[in-house]
Interface confidence: medium
């Protein structure tokens, strides 16, 4: 089959936005299936048209309504003939237009009077492409070949920059880059003590505006009274905006405040936030737990627990826990050192423990008391010890 691209030179240069029709003539085949290929890839689309000139002569068209840069490349047509693919000579399609930016100036944030650079690059065809820089509405410097780097010694306020690219087809303007001034960060806010124990406190906060410079760290300052002696100062890398304060004194009033810093320096401190650590749970278990059987049930008695340390605070009610081997169990809260136990099965063994509680929680359990179903009373000892009459 005779195959040729008609009416197209080896190089075809078209302006962006113009239509292009590539014609491919095929002779010596009755029903050619003409395929168009661009840069080695088949152009699969319904824009392809055919003229049957005669039984053995066809003209195929590839119609591009409005060419753009992405249409530029090497085109050819091809047909299958007897199992072999025959290809035409190629045509190089060049799309000319106003410059196309490959690099545009980016927004920046810089410290006052600090030097910085902006970059701009644009390409044709046609070449050459020259770059002109603008600072706001003022042209700065003469045309420079693309690519161009603008060196700025510094700014004292937010300033806008753009570049303009020129070639024989006209000019194109880049995006406008805003160069912002960096500043100290704003104070953090929403400072919350999220978890409290007797010796630890977890703190979380929201960062204020970063002053257009990355926040590097935050400082948590702790005192025992607002403005009093500093007990603790913790510097934490951020994010996350959290901190664990350790080794605090139980049942103590504290205040904390937070500030954060970027490369330019620290923010103001946020307002003081008061908090109080929890006291200690009781350290001692009730002693001498014993039982007295009566006709109406079982009376349990134990010795009063005296606070060992002031940090334990006032000791509150006692908690009594009992269980039987039939699975029955219960807990009682009693104010004194004596409890009347009901609702248990005298035919089953009974195990009883007691602890003293305060605002923090319950202290250690006493030694378990085993009341045997054979006993008229019980005594403290290992869970399976028995006392018989």
């Amino acid at each position: 089959a005779g195959l040729k691209l008609m009416g197209a030179p080896v190089k075809l240069t078209v302006s962006q936005g113009q239509p292009v029709k590539l014609n491919c003539s095929v002779e010596g085949m009755e029903e050619p299936d003409i395929q168009w290929v661009k840069d080695g890839a088949v152009v699969q689309n319904l824009d392809q048209l055919y003229i049957p000139v005669s039984e053995q002569h066809w003209i195929g068209f590839l119609s591009l309504k409005s060419v753009e840069r992405s249409d530029a490349g090497r085109y050819w047509c091809q047909v299958e003939d007897g199992g072999e693919t025959e290809i035409s000579q190629p045509v190089w399609l060049t799309v000319e237009g106003v410059p196309f930016f490959t690099v545009e100036p980016k927004d920046l944030a810089v410290p006052p009077n600090a030097p910085f650079q902006l970059s701009c690059e644009a390409v044709g065809p046609p070449e050459p492409v020259t770059i002109v820089w603008w600072r706001g509405t003022t042209k700065i410097g003469g045309p420079a070949p693309s690519p161009s780097v603008l060196n700025v010694t510094g700014v004292t306020q937010s300033t806008m920059f753009s570049c303009e690219a020129h070639n024989l087809k006209g000019l194109a303007s880049s995006r406008t880059a805003t160069v912002h001034l960096q500043a100290l960060p704003a104070a953090p806010f929403n400072i919350t003590v999220t978890k409290l124990s007797s010796s630890n406190a977890s703190v979380a906060w929201m960062p204020g505006a970063d002053g257009r410079a990355l926040l590097q760290s935050c400082t948590v300052q702790v005192t025992q009274a607002p403005g009093g002696w500093e007990v603790l100062a913790v510097v934490v890398p951020v994010p996350p905006f959290t901190c664990l304060l350790r080794d605090l004194v139980p049942a103590t009033n504290y205040s904390l405040r937070v500030r954060c810093a970027n490369a330019l320096g620290p923010s103001p401190y946020a307002d003081w936030v008061p908090f109080q650590t929890k006291g200690l749970a009781p350290a001692s278990a009730p002693q001498n737990l014993h039982a007295i059987r009566t006709d109406s049930g079982l009376i349990l008695e134990w010795e009063e627990v005296i606070p060992e340390a002031p940090l334990e605070g006032p000791l509150g009610p006692y908690k009594l826990s009992w269980v039987q081997d039939n699975g029955t169990q219960d807990e009682l809260t009693v104010e004194g050192t004596r409890a009347n136990l009901t609702g248990w099965d005298p035919q089953k063994d009974l195990i009883v423990r007691v602890c003293v509680s305060n605002a923090v929680g319950c202290g250690p359990w006493s030694q378990p008391l085993v009341v045997s179903s054979h006993d008229r009373a019980g005594q403290q000892g290992p869970p399976h010890s028995r006392t018989s009459w």
């Epitope: 299936d33 699969q44 055919y50 309504k65």
Partner: antibody, heavy 125, light 108 residues
């Protein structure tokens, strides 16, 4: 004179299969593409798909891909539109259209200039 | 999937100019085609490749295209021009065709 003669269709139940045909005359069948266009009652035109001159390539609209099959028999100059499983929403008029070629003078693209009379496909339970 | 958007209806008095628009993201790169469909009939091609009039179509029919909008203009509309008008184009990759939703032209 270019003519596209389309087959008729009886009422079909949902789930049934169906093939409708479009026989071309008055021109060389392999000089042109055949496209299919749907028009639901009281609604607009919808491009369904097309088959190339020699039957080697088929294109489908996204809404019809996988739901219909377009084929052609060059020996009888007939194009076909086939459903494996009809749905009530397939009730419509279906046109076959000669397309994608040029007149012998090479001046007017015959984009959908020759239309068949249409085949009404009613699908109802 | 790709869509072409047309106004559902346009009304003009006889002798006035009717304009029917068709918008689609691929229209800067793909040609628009316009069809006229009268009640109970198959569609008829009126305009091809944005602005070329099919032979036998009255000169009052013209087409244009700018950016993502194609326009069919009927200068001095006649009562016999009352019909549904559809734009047609290709999706951006050229692999399927799309009709607009259609515009009902009423010539009062």
């Amino acid at each position: 004179e270019v003519q596209l003669v389309q087959s008729g269709a009886d009422v079909k139940k949902p789930g049934a299969s169906l093939t409708i045909s479009c026989q071309a005359s008055g021109y060389t069948f392999t000089d042109y593409w055949i496209s299919w266009v749907r028009q639901k009652p009281g609604k607009g035109l919808e491009w369904m798909g097309a088959i190339s001159r020699n039957g080697s390539t088929t294109y489908y609209g996204p809404s019809f891909q996988g739901h219909v099959t377009i084929s052609a028999d060059r020996s009888t100059a007939t194009a076909y539109l086939q459903w494996r499983s009809l749905e009530a929403s397939d009730t419509a008029m279906y046109y076959c259209v000669r397309s994608g070629g040029l007149t012998s003078g090479g001046t007017i693209p015959e984009y959908y200039q020759h239309w068949g009379p249409g085949t009404l496909v009613p699908v109802s339970s | 999937s790709y869509e072409l958007t047309q106004p559902p209806s346009v009304s003009v008095s006889p002798g006035q100019t009717a304009r029917i628009t068709c918008s689609g993201d691929a229209l800067p790169k793909k040609y628009a085609y316009w069809y006229q469909q009268k009640s109970g009939q198959a569609p008829v091609l009126v305009i091809y490749e944005d602005k070329k009039r099919v032979s036998g179509i009255p000169e009052r029919f013209s087409g244009s295209s700018s950016g993502t909008m194609a326009t069919l203009t009927i200068s001095g509309a006649q009562v016999e021009d009352e019909a549904d008008y559809y734009c047609y184009s290709l999706a951006v990759d050229g692999n399927y065709g799309v009709f607009g939703g259609g515009t009902k032209l009423t010539v009062l």
